[in-house]
C-alpha cells in the first residue's frame, strides 16, 4: 500500500523519493507523475529529469531538494483539494526492467480555521513556513522559541504538523532509498 | 508531418532472422519511449516489446523474450527490431508506434508485413 | 498476466444509435486504460487514454469512463465513419495487454 503523506490547503507539499547515484553527477532519469506507476515511466508526467537536468515541469511541481545527489523529493506549491490522491516517483535504473517505483499518497485536509484574538497573530501567518510539509525541524525549533503569541492549543497543533512532515524520513528509514551500482 | 515509417517486413522461413526498422518524422524519438505491436492475420492486437528514451531500459513479451532484440539510434531517429529463430506464430503486421502517458500509443505507423513460413 | 475481457464481440447499431463497449480487467489497473479504434487495412488510432481522456483531435462523440477492474467506451451517436473494431489496452503493468476487439457495424 502506498506511504501517506498529508498538507493543508494552502501550503506546500512535500513528497519525498530518493536514490543514491553510483558516483557523484552520475544520475539516472526520474519522473514524477500523478496516479500511481504505470507500466513505462510516468503517467501525467509533472516533472521530468535525465542524466543531467529537470528536463520538464509543470506550474507548482518542483524539486528542492539537491536531486544531483539523489534527492528527487517533490514540492507541490500551494496546494488544493484537488492535488489530493496517488503520486508515482519512478527512478529510471538502467537494465532490463529494473525501474524502481513509489507510489505515495497525497492527503490534502482544508485549512484550519483558528481564531484570533487581538493580541494573537494568525497562526498560518505567524508560521508560513512552518505549514510546509518540506520543513527542517531545527529551524522550527528556533522559529518557535521567538514568537511568544501563541497559545497552547496552537504548540500542539505544530507539534502534529511536525510531525506530519517529518514522515518524510520515514521513507528513508524504511529502507526506500535506492543505491544505484 | 508527425509520422512513423515501417521497412523490412518480408517472407522468412522457420528458424530465420528479420530487422525492421522504424523512420520517425516530426518528432524526436529520444524524447519518448517506442514500442513495437503486432496483429496476426485476422487477430487481435499484441505488445511485443518498448524500450526507453535513450536505450538503456528495454522491455519483452515473454512470447518474443530471447529472441527478439528492441534498439534505437536516436542520432538516426530510428527504432529497430531485430528477430531472430523466427517461429509461423511470429507472421503478423508489425507496428512501430510511440508511447505516450506512461503506456498508451498515440501515433503508429502502417505497419510491416512479416511472414514466417517454409 | 492481465486479461482483459471485451463486450460484445460484434455490435450491430443505426446511424445515430447510442453504442457502449464495455471492457472488464483481470485485476485493478487504476484508470491506466487505452481505447482505440481500426479500421480494415489500416492501423489502429488512439480515441481515449487514461480511461476518460479524449486524444487530441478526436470527435467528442467518443467517451470512456472506469476504473479500477471495469470500464466503458461509448460513442454518443453512431456515424457510418465509426465502422470498426475497437480495443480496449491496459498499462498497468508488464507485459502490456489488450482486449479481443469489438467489431461495429451498421444496421
Known amino acids: 500500500s502506498e506511504v501517506e503523506y498529508r498538507a493543508e490547503v494552502g501550503q506546500n507539499a512535500y513528497l519525498p523519493c530518493f536514490y543514491t547515484p553510483a558516483a557523484p553527477g552520475n544520475l539516472v532519469p526520474v519522473c514524477w507523475g500523478k496516479g500511481a506507476c504505470p507500466v513505462f515511466e510516468c503517467g501525467n508526467v509533472v516533472l521530468r529529469t535525465d542524466e543531467r537536468d529537470v528536463n520538464y515541469w509543470t506550474s507548482r511541481y518542483w524539486l528542492n531538494g539537491d536531486f544531483r545527489k539523489g534527492d528527487v523529493s517533490l514540492t507541490i506549491e500551494n496546494v488544493t483539494l484537488a492535488d489530493s490522491g496517488i503520486y508515482c516517483c519512478r527512478i529510471q535504473i538502467p537494465g532490463i526492467m529494473n525501474d524502481e517505483k513509489f507510489n505515495l499518497k497525497l492527503v490534502i485536509k482544508p485549512a484550519k480555521v483558528t481564531p484570533a484574538p487581538t493580541r494573537q497573530r494568525d497562526f498560518t501567518a505567524a508560521f508560513p513556513r512552518m505549514l510546509t510539509t518540506r520543513g527542517h525541524g531545527p529551524a522550527e525549533t528556533q522559529t518557535l522559541g521567538s514568537l511568544p503569541d501563541i497559545n497552547l492549543t496552537q504548540i500542539s497543533t505544530l507539534a502534529n504538523e511536525l510531525r506530519d512532515s517529518r514522515l518524510a524520513n520515514d521513507l528513508r528509514d524504511s529502507g526506500a532509498t535506492i543505491r544505484i551500482g | 508531418e508527425v509520422q512513423l515509417l515501417e521497412s523490412g517486413g518480408g517472407l522468412v522461413q522457420p528458424g530465420g532472422s528479420l530487422r525492421l526498422s522504424c523512420a520517425a518524422s516530426?518528432?524526436?524519438?529520444?524524447?519518448?519511449?517506442m514500442s513495437w505491436v503486432r496483429q496476426a492475420p485476422g487477430k487481435g492486437l499484441e505488445w511485443v516489446a518498448a524500450?526507453?528514451?535513450?536505450?538503456?531500459?528495454?522491455y519483452y513479451a515473454n512470447s518474443v523474450k530471447g529472441r527478439f532484440t528492441i534498439s534505437r539510434d536516436n542520432s538516426k531517429n530510428t527504432l529497430y527490431l531485430q528477430m531472430n529463430s523466427l517461429k509461423t506464430e511470429d507472421t503478423a503486421v508489425y507496428y512501430c508506434?510511440?508511447?505516450?502517458?506512461?503506456?498508451?500509443?498515440?501515433?503508429w505507423g502502417r505497419g510491416t508485413l512479416v511472414t514466417v513460413s517454409s | 498476466d492481465i486479461v482483459m475481457t471485451q463486450s460484445p464481440s460484434t455490435l450491430s447499431a443505426s446511424v445515430g444509435d447510442r453504442v457502449t463497449i464495455t471492457c472488464r480487467a483481470s485485476?485493478?489497473?487504476?484508470?491506466?486504460l487505452a481505447w482505440y479504434q481500426q479500421k480494415p487495412g489500416k492501423a489502429p488510432k488512439l480515441l481515449i487514454y487514461?480511461?476518460?481522456s479524449l486524444q487530441s483531435g478526436v470527435p467528442s462523440r467518443f467517451s470512456g469512463s472506469g476504473s479500477g477492474t471495469d470500464f466503458t467506451f461509448t460513442i454518443s451517436s453512431l456515424q457510418p465513419e465509426d465502422i470498426a473494431t475497437y480495443y480496449c489496452?491496459?498499462?498497468?503493468?508488464?507485459?502490456?495487454?489488450f482486449g479481443q476487439g469489438t467489431k461495429v457495424e451498421i444496421k
Open positions: 508506434v510511440r508511447v505516450r502517458d506512461g503506456g498508451s500509443f498515440d501515433l
Open positions: 516530426g518528432f524526436t524519438v529520444s524524447s519518448n519511449y
Open positions: 524500450i526507453s528514451f535513450d536505450g538503456s531500459n528495454k
Open positions: 485485476e485493478s489497473i487504476s484508470s491506466w
Open positions: 487514461t480511461a476518460s
Open positions: 489496452q491496459h498499462y498497468a503493468n508488464l507485459p502490456l495487454t
